[in-house]
């Protein structure tokens, strides 16, 4: 348990300490305090570098001191013969004696007390970004007006996050723009538009001045745009280095402005607006789009009509056109539907005639019906040739979809009658 | 057939055989047989055969049997209580509608009907072919098909022949323009059992074809002149009857 003070005595003190001893003491005072360790008596066998017998004071990995020999106070008003001040709350004291002592040595007597440390001044690293306030047992950080203390309780920043922009048009600027932006801040702005609209950000080169990148090209202060899994930036420097128009292809955009402790500039100002999400004009062969436009955007509806001889097969129902809507995600509905050649299917059989199997039954294919000659002929004309028409029927130029009719040839005997002379 | 020659069914593929009464008919399309009214007046469900030269029972079993669906006798044919005493053979024509269509081939195919133009008006001397399994010089019924070629003759030639076994006065026999008189050459004639068969004449507009100019009807005496129903006069009735009693499959 941490204590505010304590006493440490060598073994058998004030009698002579024994040979071959190693003893250690772990001193701990409460958090926020340092340790003042002082010796009032020191009588340890002297050797070079205190190699034989010694008392060692260790703070963490650092040896604060190693003592041996005899000491006496230089100050008649103080019994202290040696002292140590450490700004940490833990200290280790180790006493060692070797196998022989040529004389009788009485060892040491030491005391420690918890002392206040000034965290604001005692360390190389300043614990607070702005104002440091010391108190007994600790310190606290504070901030100038309009700054707030971050959750780490050390860094100050401006309160520049949490804004959500939902209007279809707007303007966003860095804090204090065009005055220098605050150091050591992370500003997050959210733009959230209705689905189907993409955020388009517009910046002018002269409206951007952010601390430049270091020699390795890393931005010290940076402006980043994040739209879903796409990132634009980081951007920094004098004059905006990115595209002046950023089409995010998303209805949600996060703007993150991160600054460090130094080098504040005037910052940035941007405009944004919501563009209806564009849908690319897809290549749909054998079809016509109505209406025809150079650009299609969210909520646009087109009728895709198949060219003659092509049809949309949805499930197994044939149609000649379908509607497609530009959706909020920038994709067309019904995008799986395609215009494919009409299939007229197997031609119907006819009585007393036949149709040769066509190579194909698709649009434009030709079939020919013939009658079983010489006993049947085609009565209703048309020549027997049919083509696969756009409506999915086999069509003849004369008869249309009507099938040819094979009727018996009349009055033709297979062999002529010859009278036998008697 | 008197004075005729042996024929093959391929010479007369339209020839239909009726076994009761023993008679003939002419196939005019897949569903219809044309015959004489007196053939079917007593049997409205005749059994018919096509495609065989011989009408021997064993041969008929292998030929195509036709099943009638309905018999249509010309409305002008006078039905008698005692048909044997008939002296009026005017309008001796009937149609038999078949249940199933006939499949055509080398031994079965129809004969054409006459056109309605004057080209199909017969002149004396025009030749026609008759065929059948009726009485011959030697036997009452022929087993194998017989045929003969005979010329059209003036109606008076038929009138002049004395009826062989008259059932009434000679004057009682009716002769009308609905009848064709043919024969009188080399004793070639049709006879009992040939009734209903076609008197086939070469089509004036297509020499490769024959049409049914007449149907074997009656005669005063076998081996002289015979009378044939003039089919041309009935083409309208034939067409109307077939149209009114056809299935959509035939239309």
């Amino acid at each position: 348990e941490p204590t505010m003070y304590g006493e440490i005595l060598s073994p058998n003190y004030p009698q002579a300490y024994p040979s071959e001893v190693e003893k250690s003491w772990d001193i701990e005072v409460p958090e926020g305090y340092g340790i003042h360790l002082y010796f009032t008596h020191l009588d340890i066998e002297l050797s070079e570098n205190c190699a034989y017998d010694s008392v060692q004071i260790i703070s963490g990995d650092t040896e604060e001191g190693r003592l041996c020999g005899q000491r006496s106070s230089n100050n008649p008003h103080s019994p202290i013969v040696e002292e140590f001040q450490v700004p940490y709350n833990k200290l280790q004291v180790i006493f060692k004696s070797d196998f022989s002592n040529e004389e009788r040595f009485t060892g040491f007597a030491a005391y420690y007390v918890a002392t206040d440390i000034n965290e604001c001044t005692d360390f190389v690293d300043v614990p607070c970004s702005h104002f440091c306030n010391n108190f007994i047992g600790g310190y606290f950080c504070s901030c100038p007006p309009e700054y707030f203390l971050h959750d780490d309780m050390k860094n100050c920043g401006v309160n520049c996050s949490g804004d959500v922009f939902t209007a279809l048009i707007g303007e966003i600027a860095s804090p204090n723009y065009p005055k220098p932006y605050p150091e050591n801040s992370r500003c997050e702005y959210q733009i959230r538009l209705e689905k189907g609209f993409q955020v388009v950000v517009t910046l002018r080169r002269e409206d951007f001045d952010v601390e430049a990148a270091d020699s390795a090209g890393n931005c010290l202060d940076s402006l980043v745009f994040v739209a879903g899994d796409r990132q634009f930036g980081p951007y920094c420097g004098h004059g905006f280095p990115g595209p002046l128009n950023i089409e995010t292809k998303s209805n949600a955009l996060d703007i993150i402005f991160q600054t460090d402790l130094t080098g504040q500039k005037k910052g940035w100002k941007l405009r944004y607006h919501g563009d209806p999400m564009p849908c690319p004009k897809e290549d749909t062969p054998n079809s016509v789009w109505e209406p025809a436009k150079a650009k299609y955007v969210f909520r646009d509806v087109v009728q895709i009509t198949c060219l003659d001889g092509f049809e949309v097969v949805e499930g197994r129902v044939g149609a000649t056109s379908f509607y497609s809507t530009c959706q909020s995600n920038g994709k067309w509905s019904n995008s799986k539907l395609k215009c494919q050649p009409v299939d007229c299917g197997i031609p119907e059989s006819i009585e007393n005639g036949k149709v040769e199997d066509p190579e194909s039954t698709l649009f434009g294919s030709v079939i020919r019906y013939t009658c079983e000659e010489p006993y049947y002929y085609m009565e209703n004309g048309g020549g027997g040739e049919y083509h696969c028409a756009g409506n999915g029927s086999w069509v003849n130029e004369v008869l249309g979809p009507e099938l040819p009719k094979c009727v018996p040839v009349c009055g033709v005997p297979r062999e002529p009658f010859e009278e036998k002379q008697r | 057939i008197i004075g005729g020659s042996d024929a093959d069914i391929k010479n007369f593929p339209w020839q239909v055989f009726f076994d009761n009464p023993w008679a003939g008919g002419a196939l005019i399309n897949e569903y219809w047989v044309l015959t004489a009214a007196h053939v079917v007046e007593g049997n409205r469900e005749p059994t018919m055969y096509v495609g065989s030269t011989s009408v021997q029972t064993s041969r008929l079993a292998k030929s195509k049997m036709l099943t009638p669906e309905h018999v249509f006798i010309h409305p002008g044919w006078k039905l008698l209580e005692v048909p044997e005493g008939r002296t009026n053979f005017d309008n001796d024509i009937a149609l038999v509608r078949l249940k199933d269509p006939v499949k055509m081939g080398p031994t079965v195919s129809p004969i054409c009907l006459p056109g309605t133009s004057s080209d199909y008006n017969l002149m004396d001397g025009d030749l026609g072919l008759i065929s059948g399994w009726g009485r011959t010089e030697k036997r009452d019924r022929a087993v194998r098909l017989k045929a003969a070629r005979l010329p059209v003759a003036p109606l008076r030639k038929c009138k002049e022949v004395k009826v062989e076994k008259p059932t009434a006065d000679a004057e009682a026999y009716v002769f009308t323009p609905n009848m064709i008189c043919a024969g009188g050459e080399k004793g070639m004639d049709s006879c009992k059992g040939d009734s209903g068969g076609a008197f086939a004449v070469q089509d004036p507009n297509d020499k490769t074809k024959f049409y049914a100019a007449g149907l074997v009807s009656w005669g005063p005496q076998c081996g002289t002149y015979g009378l044939y129903t003039r089919v041309k006069n009935y083409v309208d009735w034939i067409m109307k009857t077939m149209q009114e009693n056809s299935t959509p499959r035939e239309d």
């Epitope: 097969v313 197994r316 129902v317 044939g318 299939d343 007229c344 299917g345 197997i346 031609p347 119907e348 059989s349 006819i350 009585e351 005639g353 036949k354 149709v355 040769e356 199997d357 066509p358 190579e359 039954t361 079983e372 999915g392 099938l403 | 959509p248 499959r249």
Partner: antibody, heavy 118, light 109 residues
Framework: EVMLVESGGGLVKPGGSLRLSCAAS????????MSWVRQAPGKGLEWVAT????????YYLDSVKHRFTISRDNSKDTLYLQMNSLRAEDTALYYC???????????WGQGTLVTVSS | QIVLTQSPATLSLSPGERATLSCTAS???????LHWYQQKPGKAPKLWIY???NLASGVPSRFSGSGSGTDYTLTISSLQPEDFATYYC??????????FGQGTKLEIK
């Protein structure tokens, strides 16, 4: 007279194969498209497959696609149905039928019974 | 696929009565491709009416067929004992599997 006579049916285990035949007579077989239709016991008619007159074009019920193959030999006036990977639900009386105007089936065989059971 | 629904599933009537059998398609069918078959127990189906209204060979004239679009009807003007059987409607559409209705059983009351 038009006649269609099916054969080749029988009892087969699931996953097994059968080949049905349909012998045609009384008409010019090569002039007609043909179909197989099945009827499960006590159930209605279900079309299975169709083949064009020359055999170049075939159409199948989705559930038999890639398992059944319809074919024909016009020189033998015979229609076939090769059935592989048979399932219990393929149990039925299988009819062959001739296709006519409007793809109506104007002549049917008497059927051959296929039973798929373990 | 085009589904054909026949109604009623069973029709009980007496000889001499008029019978009306209905076949409704889930989407429009060409009248040229709508057919009816008659099937008696243990027998193969027989083509009865083809292309909506044409009687097949040997079918008595008391039978008639009509309809268009999605609604088709087979009518028997005066039932005869031999007419009691199951009737199926059937459609062909080039993009579809050929389908049959589930059948209407016409039975003697």
């Amino acid at each position: 007279e038009v006649m269609l006579v099916e054969s080749g049916g029988g009892l087969v285990k699931p996953g097994g194969s059968l080949r049905l035949s349909c012998a045609a007579s009384g008409f010019t077989f090569s002039n007609y498209a043909m179909s197989w239709v099945r009827q499960a016991p006590g159930k209605g008619l279900e079309w299975v497959a169709t083949i064009s007159s020359g055999g170049s074009h075939t159409y199948y019920l989705d559930s038999v696609k890639h398992r059944f193959t319809i074919s024909r030999d016009n020189s033998k006036d015979t229609l076939y149905l090769q059935m592989n990977s048979l399932r219990a639900e393929d149990t039925a009386l299988y009819y062959c039928a001739r296709l006519f105007t409007g793809h109506a089936m104007d002549y049917w065989g008497q059927g051959t019974l296929v039973t798929v059971s373990s | 696929q085009i589904v054909l629904t026949q109604s009623p599933a069973t029709l009980s009537l007496s000889p001499g009565e008029r019978a009306t059998l209905s076949c409704t398609a889930s989407s429009s069918v060409s009248s040229s491709y709508l057919h009816w078959y008659q099937q008696k127990p243990g027998k193969a189906p027989k083509l009865w009416i083809y292309s909506t209204s044409n009687l097949a060979s040997g079918v008595p004239s008391r039978f008639s067929g009509s309809g268009s679009g999605t609604d088709y009807t087979l009518t028997i003007s005066s039932l005869q004992p031999e007419d009691f059987a199951t009737y199926y409607c059937h459609q062909y559409y080039r993009l579809h599997p050929i389908t049959f209705g589930q059948g209407t059983k016409l039975e003697i009351k």
